[in-house]
Protein backbone atom coordinates (compact mmCIF):
# COMPACT_ATOMS: atom_id res chain seq x y z
CA UNK A 1 0.00 0.00 0.00
CA UNK A 2 1.02 3.33 -0.82
CA UNK A 3 2.18 5.24 2.30
CA UNK A 4 0.24 8.26 1.25
CA UNK A 5 1.32 11.82 2.69
CA UNK A 6 -1.83 13.54 1.40
CA UNK A 7 -4.99 14.20 3.32
CA UNK A 8 -8.00 12.95 1.65
CA UNK A 9 -9.97 14.90 4.46
CA UNK A 10 -8.71 18.05 3.95
CA UNK A 11 -5.78 20.01 4.45
CA UNK A 12 -4.58 19.54 8.39
CA UNK A 13 -7.59 16.72 9.42
CA UNK A 14 -4.81 13.96 8.99
CA UNK A 15 -2.19 12.32 11.48
CA UNK A 16 0.48 14.92 11.77
CA UNK A 17 2.74 16.76 14.12
CA UNK A 18 0.57 19.41 16.89
CA UNK A 19 2.49 21.61 18.81
CA UNK A 20 0.64 22.32 22.55
CA UNK A 21 1.76 24.94 24.62
CA UNK A 22 1.41 23.71 28.25
CA UNK A 23 2.91 24.96 31.84
CA UNK A 24 4.45 22.54 34.55
CA UNK A 25 0.89 22.71 35.99
CA UNK A 26 -0.75 21.65 33.01
CA UNK A 27 1.40 18.45 33.01
CA UNK A 28 1.56 17.89 36.65
CA UNK A 29 4.79 18.46 37.06
CA UNK A 30 5.22 21.89 38.64
CA UNK A 31 6.47 20.79 41.80
CA UNK A 32 9.44 18.51 40.69
CA UNK A 33 10.60 20.45 37.23
CA UNK A 34 12.66 24.29 37.66
CA UNK A 35 13.07 24.46 34.03
CA UNK A 36 11.85 24.98 31.70
CA UNK A 37 8.22 25.89 33.54
CA UNK A 38 6.85 25.68 30.49
CA UNK A 39 6.90 23.68 27.60
CA UNK A 40 5.97 23.50 23.69
CA UNK A 41 4.79 19.95 23.56
CA UNK A 42 4.70 18.19 20.15
CA UNK A 43 2.50 15.31 19.68
CA UNK A 44 0.42 13.80 17.60
CA UNK A 45 -2.98 14.36 16.01
CA UNK A 46 -5.42 13.67 13.39
CA UNK A 47 -7.32 11.07 11.72
CA UNK A 48 -5.90 8.15 9.71
CA UNK A 49 -7.70 7.26 6.91
CA UNK A 50 -6.73 4.18 4.16
CA UNK A 51 -3.10 4.16 3.11
CA UNK A 52 -2.48 7.77 4.91
CA UNK A 53 0.98 7.16 6.27
CA UNK A 54 0.69 3.39 7.32
CA UNK A 55 3.33 2.76 9.64
CA UNK A 56 3.75 -1.23 8.67
CA UNK A 57 1.42 -3.95 7.36
CA UNK A 58 -0.30 -4.32 11.17
CA UNK A 59 -1.62 -1.04 10.71
CA UNK A 60 -3.00 -1.80 6.84
CA UNK A 61 -4.26 -5.11 8.62
CA UNK A 62 -6.47 -2.69 10.90
CA UNK A 63 -7.81 -0.99 8.49
CA UNK A 64 -9.25 -3.75 6.34
CA UNK A 65 -10.58 -5.37 9.20
CA UNK A 66 -12.13 -1.77 10.68
CA UNK A 67 -14.11 -1.04 7.32
CA UNK A 68 -15.40 -4.35 7.39
CA UNK A 69 -16.09 -4.82 11.20
CA UNK A 70 -16.47 -1.11 12.08
CA UNK A 71 -17.85 -1.88 15.90
CA UNK A 72 -15.17 -4.86 16.68
CA UNK A 73 -11.87 -3.11 14.97
CA UNK A 74 -10.96 0.48 15.32
CA UNK A 75 -9.15 2.81 12.72
CA UNK A 76 -5.52 2.65 12.89
CA UNK A 77 -4.57 5.46 15.48
CA UNK A 78 -2.27 9.14 15.14
CA UNK A 79 0.83 8.34 17.54
CA UNK A 80 4.50 8.96 17.52
CA UNK A 81 6.85 7.26 14.86
CA UNK A 82 9.99 8.85 16.52
CA UNK A 83 10.46 11.08 19.64
CA UNK A 84 12.68 14.20 20.27
CA UNK A 85 14.75 14.60 23.62
CA UNK A 86 13.87 16.74 25.77
CA UNK A 87 16.02 18.84 28.74
CA UNK A 88 14.88 19.12 32.10
CA UNK A 89 16.37 20.89 35.04
CA UNK A 90 14.99 19.20 38.52
CA UNK A 91 14.32 19.43 41.76
CA UNK A 92 16.51 16.72 43.67
CA UNK A 93 17.68 15.52 47.36
CA UNK A 94 20.39 17.44 47.36
CA UNK A 95 19.58 20.30 44.67
CA UNK A 96 19.30 20.48 41.17
CA UNK A 97 20.13 17.61 38.28
CA UNK A 98 19.91 18.16 34.51
CA UNK A 99 17.93 15.34 33.01
CA UNK A 100 17.44 14.44 29.55
CA UNK A 101 13.74 12.35 28.49
CA UNK A 102 14.17 10.62 25.23
CA UNK A 103 10.28 9.92 25.08
CA UNK A 104 8.49 12.60 26.00
CA UNK A 105 8.08 14.98 22.59
CA UNK A 106 6.82 13.56 19.42
CA UNK A 107 9.32 13.88 16.20
CA UNK A 108 6.67 12.73 13.63
CA UNK A 109 3.72 10.60 13.05
CA UNK A 110 2.30 7.46 11.37
CA UNK A 111 -0.67 5.67 11.92
CA UNK A 112 -0.69 2.10 13.52
CA UNK B 1 3.03 7.61 37.42
CA UNK B 2 2.45 4.05 37.86
CA UNK B 3 2.09 1.81 34.75
CA UNK B 4 -1.16 0.32 35.72
CA UNK B 5 -2.58 -3.31 34.52
CA UNK B 6 -6.13 -3.57 36.42
CA UNK B 7 -8.71 -1.70 34.41
CA UNK B 8 -10.51 0.85 35.91
CA UNK B 9 -13.68 0.51 33.52
CA UNK B 10 -14.10 -2.80 34.19
CA UNK B 11 -12.51 -6.70 32.80
CA UNK B 12 -11.75 -6.85 29.07
CA UNK B 13 -12.37 -3.11 28.47
CA UNK B 14 -8.96 -1.33 28.49
CA UNK B 15 -6.52 -1.65 26.19
CA UNK B 16 -5.27 -5.04 25.73
CA UNK B 17 -4.42 -7.64 22.85
CA UNK B 18 -7.40 -9.45 20.91
CA UNK B 19 -7.66 -11.87 18.46
CA UNK B 20 -10.14 -11.51 15.43
CA UNK B 21 -10.31 -14.27 13.06
CA UNK B 22 -9.98 -12.90 9.45
CA UNK B 23 -10.00 -14.85 6.14
CA UNK B 24 -7.32 -13.84 3.09
CA UNK B 25 -10.11 -11.61 1.18
CA UNK B 26 -10.62 -9.53 4.20
CA UNK B 27 -7.28 -8.58 4.38
CA UNK B 28 -7.31 -8.08 0.58
CA UNK B 29 -4.55 -10.82 0.44
CA UNK B 30 -6.24 -13.34 -1.68
CA UNK B 31 -4.55 -12.04 -5.05
CA UNK B 32 -0.98 -12.33 -3.61
CA UNK B 33 -0.84 -15.13 -0.44
CA UNK B 34 -1.27 -18.49 -0.65
CA UNK B 35 -0.95 -19.47 2.48
CA UNK B 36 -2.36 -19.17 5.42
CA UNK B 37 -5.85 -19.22 4.04
CA UNK B 38 -7.05 -17.59 7.30
CA UNK B 39 -5.33 -15.63 9.62
CA UNK B 40 -6.02 -14.91 13.09
CA UNK B 41 -5.13 -11.63 13.82
CA UNK B 42 -3.77 -10.51 17.17
CA UNK B 43 -4.11 -6.55 17.84
CA UNK B 44 -4.67 -4.07 20.40
CA UNK B 45 -7.82 -2.54 21.28
CA UNK B 46 -9.73 -0.81 23.97
CA UNK B 47 -9.27 2.50 25.74
CA UNK B 48 -6.46 4.09 27.39
CA UNK B 49 -7.43 5.27 30.80
CA UNK B 50 -5.12 7.26 33.55
CA UNK B 51 -2.02 5.96 34.18
CA UNK B 52 -2.89 2.72 32.41
CA UNK B 53 -0.36 1.13 30.78
CA UNK B 54 1.19 3.90 29.55
CA UNK B 55 4.23 3.56 26.82
CA UNK B 56 6.04 6.67 28.03
CA UNK B 57 6.01 10.04 29.83
CA UNK B 58 4.92 10.93 26.25
CA UNK B 59 1.57 9.44 27.62
CA UNK B 60 1.44 10.43 30.16
CA UNK B 61 1.53 14.06 28.89
CA UNK B 62 -0.83 13.46 26.44
CA UNK B 63 -3.23 11.96 29.13
CA UNK B 64 -2.76 15.43 31.35
CA UNK B 65 -3.45 17.34 28.39
CA UNK B 66 -6.59 15.48 27.33
CA UNK B 67 -8.30 15.98 30.36
CA UNK B 68 -7.72 19.57 30.54
CA UNK B 69 -8.08 20.13 26.54
CA UNK B 70 -10.29 17.17 25.86
CA UNK B 71 -11.32 18.67 22.19
CA UNK B 72 -8.02 19.76 21.14
CA UNK B 73 -6.05 16.71 22.54
CA UNK B 74 -6.73 13.21 22.17
CA UNK B 75 -6.70 10.28 25.01
CA UNK B 76 -3.80 8.25 24.33
CA UNK B 77 -4.25 5.45 22.10
CA UNK B 78 -4.21 1.77 22.61
CA UNK B 79 -1.07 0.32 20.31
CA UNK B 80 1.19 -2.81 19.82
CA UNK B 81 4.09 -2.40 21.72
CA UNK B 82 5.81 -5.58 19.97
CA UNK B 83 5.10 -7.66 17.01
CA UNK B 84 5.18 -11.61 16.64
CA UNK B 85 6.86 -12.60 13.01
CA UNK B 86 4.62 -14.54 10.56
CA UNK B 87 5.14 -16.34 7.84
CA UNK B 88 3.32 -15.73 4.27
CA UNK B 89 3.74 -17.96 1.47
CA UNK B 90 3.43 -16.14 -2.16
CA UNK B 91 3.35 -15.76 -5.19
CA UNK B 92 5.61 -14.38 -7.19
CA UNK B 93 6.74 -14.09 -11.17
CA UNK B 94 8.71 -16.94 -10.97
CA UNK B 95 6.34 -19.41 -8.88
CA UNK B 96 6.08 -19.16 -5.00
CA UNK B 97 8.44 -17.77 -2.47
CA UNK B 98 7.94 -17.96 1.65
CA UNK B 99 8.35 -14.32 3.12
CA UNK B 100 8.46 -13.84 7.12
CA UNK B 101 6.42 -10.67 8.36
CA UNK B 102 7.76 -8.67 11.29
CA UNK B 103 5.16 -6.05 11.60
CA UNK B 104 1.95 -7.88 11.18
CA UNK B 105 0.82 -9.24 14.62
CA UNK B 106 0.93 -7.67 17.78
CA UNK B 107 2.55 -9.55 20.46
CA UNK B 108 1.51 -7.33 23.55
CA UNK B 109 0.15 -4.11 23.62
CA UNK B 110 0.42 0.11 25.29
CA UNK B 111 -1.02 3.45 25.79
CA UNK B 112 0.61 5.93 23.47
CA UNK C 1 11.90 37.65 19.71
CA UNK C 2 14.05 36.60 22.69
CA UNK C 3 16.88 38.97 23.73
CA UNK C 4 19.61 39.08 26.67
CA UNK C 5 21.16 42.00 27.13
CA UNK C 6 24.59 42.46 29.23
CA UNK C 7 25.95 45.37 30.80
CA UNK C 8 29.03 47.00 29.37
CA UNK C 9 32.81 46.06 29.61
CA UNK C 10 34.56 45.87 32.85
CA UNK C 11 38.40 46.88 34.09
CA UNK C 12 39.16 45.51 37.64
CA UNK C 13 41.83 45.05 39.84
CA UNK C 14 42.95 41.43 40.83
CA UNK C 15 41.26 40.28 44.26
CA UNK C 16 38.25 43.21 43.45
CA UNK C 17 34.86 41.70 42.30
CA UNK C 18 32.24 42.15 39.59
CA UNK C 19 29.08 41.83 39.10
CA UNK C 20 27.86 41.31 35.54
CA UNK C 21 24.01 41.95 34.13
CA UNK C 22 21.39 40.11 31.56
CA UNK C 23 18.16 41.69 30.86
CA UNK C 24 15.80 39.40 29.24
CA UNK C 25 12.81 40.51 26.92
CA UNK C 26 10.77 38.40 24.61
CA UNK C 27 9.88 35.78 26.74
CA UNK C 28 8.10 34.90 30.44
CA UNK C 29 11.57 35.46 32.20
CA UNK C 30 10.66 32.92 34.94
CA UNK C 31 10.25 30.43 32.75
CA UNK C 32 13.33 29.60 31.57
CA UNK C 33 17.08 29.57 33.47
CA UNK C 34 19.81 31.20 32.75
CA UNK C 35 23.83 29.77 32.30
CA UNK C 36 26.83 31.96 32.80
CA UNK C 37 29.24 30.69 30.43
CA UNK C 38 33.30 32.54 29.73
CA UNK C 39 35.40 32.82 27.08
CA UNK C 40 39.29 33.79 28.01
CA UNK C 41 40.87 35.73 25.19
CA UNK C 42 41.54 33.29 22.33
CA UNK C 43 40.68 30.39 24.48
CA UNK C 44 37.36 27.49 24.62
CA UNK C 45 34.17 28.13 26.09
CA UNK C 46 33.72 27.38 29.50
CA UNK C 47 29.78 26.67 31.51
CA UNK C 48 30.37 28.27 35.25
CA UNK C 49 27.16 27.75 36.37
CA UNK C 50 23.32 28.21 35.83
CA UNK C 51 20.18 30.04 38.46
CA UNK C 52 16.39 28.75 38.05
CA UNK C 53 15.13 32.23 37.38
CA UNK C 54 11.66 30.38 38.76
CA UNK C 55 13.25 30.00 42.32
CA UNK C 56 16.46 31.14 42.50
CA UNK C 57 18.08 27.36 42.46
CA UNK C 58 21.76 27.16 41.39
CA UNK C 59 24.33 24.73 39.89
CA UNK C 60 28.04 26.37 40.12
CA UNK C 61 31.25 24.77 38.37
CA UNK C 62 33.44 23.04 40.91
CA UNK C 63 36.26 25.24 40.52
CA UNK C 64 34.10 28.57 40.62
CA UNK C 65 32.35 27.23 44.22
CA UNK C 66 32.91 29.61 46.40
CA UNK C 67 33.71 32.62 44.13
CA UNK C 68 30.63 32.98 42.21
CA UNK C 69 26.79 33.95 42.94
CA UNK C 70 24.48 34.06 40.38
CA UNK C 71 21.12 35.66 41.00
CA UNK C 72 17.93 37.03 39.42
CA UNK C 73 15.21 39.95 39.77
CA UNK C 74 12.01 38.63 38.22
CA UNK C 75 10.91 42.15 38.61
CA UNK C 76 13.13 43.40 36.26
CA UNK C 77 13.75 40.27 34.38
CA UNK C 78 17.33 40.63 35.08
CA UNK C 79 19.99 37.94 35.72
CA UNK C 80 23.37 38.42 37.53
CA UNK C 81 26.32 36.85 37.76
CA UNK C 82 29.01 38.09 40.21
CA UNK C 83 32.33 37.17 40.66
CA UNK C 84 34.76 37.54 43.92
CA UNK C 85 38.42 37.62 44.52
CA UNK C 86 39.60 38.33 40.64
CA UNK C 87 42.59 37.22 39.10
CA UNK C 88 44.48 37.86 35.77
CA UNK C 89 42.89 34.74 34.51
CA UNK C 90 39.35 35.30 34.89
CA UNK C 91 39.77 37.91 32.55
CA UNK C 92 37.27 36.90 29.65
CA UNK C 93 33.80 37.61 27.80
CA UNK C 94 31.36 36.52 30.12
CA UNK C 95 27.87 35.38 28.28
CA UNK C 96 24.53 34.75 29.52
CA UNK C 97 22.42 31.79 27.84
CA UNK C 98 18.95 31.37 28.49
CA UNK C 99 17.74 27.11 28.96
CA UNK C 100 15.86 25.56 25.95
CA UNK C 101 13.54 22.71 26.34
CA UNK C 102 16.14 20.72 24.01
CA UNK C 103 19.32 21.67 25.98
CA UNK C 104 21.22 23.14 23.08
CA UNK C 105 20.73 27.26 23.23
CA UNK C 106 20.26 29.47 20.50
CA UNK C 107 20.17 32.33 22.95
CA UNK C 108 23.06 34.58 23.85
CA UNK C 109 23.43 37.46 25.23
CA UNK C 110 25.98 39.64 22.94
CA UNK C 111 28.86 39.20 26.19
CA UNK C 112 30.68 41.10 28.54
CA UNK C 113 34.59 41.97 28.74
CA UNK C 114 35.85 41.78 32.18
CA UNK C 115 39.47 43.08 32.21
CA UNK C 116 41.78 41.95 35.15
CA UNK C 117 44.77 44.07 35.72
CA UNK C 118 46.79 45.46 38.15
CA UNK D 1 33.13 15.85 34.45
CA UNK D 2 33.22 14.84 30.62
CA UNK D 3 35.50 15.94 28.58
CA UNK D 4 35.04 16.49 24.99
CA UNK D 5 37.94 16.55 22.86
CA UNK D 6 37.72 18.25 19.43
CA UNK D 7 39.54 17.40 16.12
CA UNK D 8 41.80 18.74 13.86
CA UNK D 9 42.53 21.72 15.78
CA UNK D 10 42.44 23.34 12.77
CA UNK D 11 40.97 22.77 9.09
CA UNK D 12 41.98 24.23 5.69
CA UNK D 13 39.73 23.85 3.30
CA UNK D 14 38.90 25.43 -0.19
CA UNK D 15 34.97 26.82 -0.66
CA UNK D 16 32.70 24.69 -2.12
CA UNK D 17 34.84 21.37 -0.64
CA UNK D 18 33.31 19.56 2.34
CA UNK D 19 34.58 19.75 5.82
CA UNK D 20 34.14 16.98 8.65
CA UNK D 21 35.05 17.91 12.06
CA UNK D 22 34.76 15.41 14.95
CA UNK D 23 34.25 15.53 18.63
CA UNK D 24 34.63 12.68 21.09
CA UNK D 25 33.34 12.64 24.35
CA UNK D 26 35.36 10.95 27.38
CA UNK D 27 32.39 9.02 28.49
CA UNK D 28 28.71 8.84 26.62
CA UNK D 29 26.44 11.26 26.44
CA UNK D 30 23.74 9.92 24.20
CA UNK D 31 22.95 11.94 21.74
CA UNK D 32 22.91 15.38 24.45
CA UNK D 33 25.20 16.99 22.30
CA UNK D 34 25.19 20.46 20.61
CA UNK D 35 27.02 22.22 17.69
CA UNK D 36 28.07 26.23 17.85
CA UNK D 37 29.45 28.56 15.06
CA UNK D 38 31.73 31.19 16.48
CA UNK D 39 33.54 34.34 14.39
CA UNK D 40 35.40 36.79 15.80
CA UNK D 41 34.04 39.30 18.09
CA UNK D 42 30.55 37.55 17.68
CA UNK D 43 28.79 35.32 20.56
CA UNK D 44 28.29 31.57 19.44
CA UNK D 45 25.27 30.73 17.27
CA UNK D 46 23.65 26.89 18.02
CA UNK D 47 23.78 24.92 14.43
CA UNK D 48 22.96 21.57 15.50
CA UNK D 49 21.46 19.89 18.83
CA UNK D 50 20.23 16.65 19.76
CA UNK D 51 23.41 15.86 18.22
CA UNK D 52 21.41 15.78 14.63
CA UNK D 53 18.56 17.87 14.67
CA UNK D 54 19.69 21.73 12.50
CA UNK D 55 18.34 24.60 15.19
CA UNK D 56 16.04 27.18 13.09
CA UNK D 57 17.46 28.95 10.38
CA UNK D 58 20.67 26.75 9.72
CA UNK D 59 21.10 25.78 6.24
CA UNK D 60 20.93 22.23 5.50
CA UNK D 61 24.34 21.83 4.03
CA UNK D 62 25.43 21.79 8.18
CA UNK D 63 24.66 18.35 9.28
CA UNK D 64 25.18 16.41 12.93
CA UNK D 65 25.46 12.59 13.23
CA UNK D 66 27.00 10.20 16.10
CA UNK D 67 25.48 9.24 19.72
CA UNK D 68 27.16 8.21 22.54
CA UNK D 69 30.87 8.87 22.74
CA UNK D 70 31.72 9.69 19.05
CA UNK D 71 30.39 12.86 16.91
CA UNK D 72 30.43 14.38 13.40
CA UNK D 73 29.60 17.98 11.80
CA UNK D 74 29.99 18.06 8.28
CA UNK D 75 29.17 21.41 5.89
CA UNK D 76 28.66 19.78 2.94
CA UNK D 77 29.97 22.75 0.71
CA UNK D 78 31.33 25.14 2.53
CA UNK D 79 30.52 28.89 1.93
CA UNK D 80 32.74 31.77 2.73
CA UNK D 81 30.54 32.87 5.79
CA UNK D 82 30.89 29.25 7.16
CA UNK D 83 35.05 29.97 7.74
CA UNK D 84 34.60 30.32 11.68
CA UNK D 85 35.40 28.20 14.81
CA UNK D 86 32.89 25.20 15.66
CA UNK D 87 32.57 24.04 19.19
CA UNK D 88 30.33 21.13 20.70
CA UNK D 89 29.15 20.66 23.65
CA UNK D 90 27.72 17.83 25.98
CA UNK D 91 24.47 18.50 28.03
CA UNK D 92 24.03 15.29 29.20
CA UNK D 93 25.29 15.76 32.59
CA UNK D 94 26.13 18.90 34.98
CA UNK D 95 29.06 20.82 34.42
CA UNK D 96 28.31 21.44 30.48
CA UNK D 97 31.70 20.81 28.59
CA UNK D 98 32.87 22.49 25.78
CA UNK D 99 35.24 20.65 23.16
CA UNK D 100 38.60 23.21 22.38
CA UNK D 101 37.37 23.87 18.94
CA UNK D 102 37.98 23.31 15.55
CA UNK D 103 38.78 26.43 13.26
CA UNK D 104 37.99 26.04 10.01
CA UNK D 105 40.26 28.83 7.90
CA UNK D 106 40.16 29.01 4.04
CA UNK D 107 43.30 26.97 2.23
Known amino acids: ARNGDRCPLGPGRCCRLHTVHASLEDLGWADWVLSPREVQVTMCIGACPSQFREANMHAQIKMNLHRLKPDTVPAPCCVPASYNPMVLIQKTDTGVSLQTYDDLLAKDCHCV | ARNGDRCPLGPGRCCRLHTVHASLEDLGWADWVLSPREVQVTMCIGACPSQFREANMHAQIKMNLHRLKPDTVPAPCCVPASYNPMVLIQKTDTGVSLQTYDDLLAKDCHCV | QVQLVQSGAEVKKPGASVKVSCKASGYTFDSYGINWVRQAPGQGLEWMGW????????AYAQELQGRVTMTTDTSTSTAYMELRSLRSDDTAVYYCVRDTQYGGSPYWGQGTLVTVSS | EIVMTQSPATLSVSPGERATLSCRAS??????LAWYQQKPGQAPRLLIYGASTRATGIPARFSGSGSGTEFTLTISSLQSEDFAVYYC?????????FGGGTKVEIK
Open chain 4, 89 to 97: QQYNNWPIT
Open chain 4, 27 to 32: QSVSSN
Open chain 3, 51 to 58: ISAYSGDT
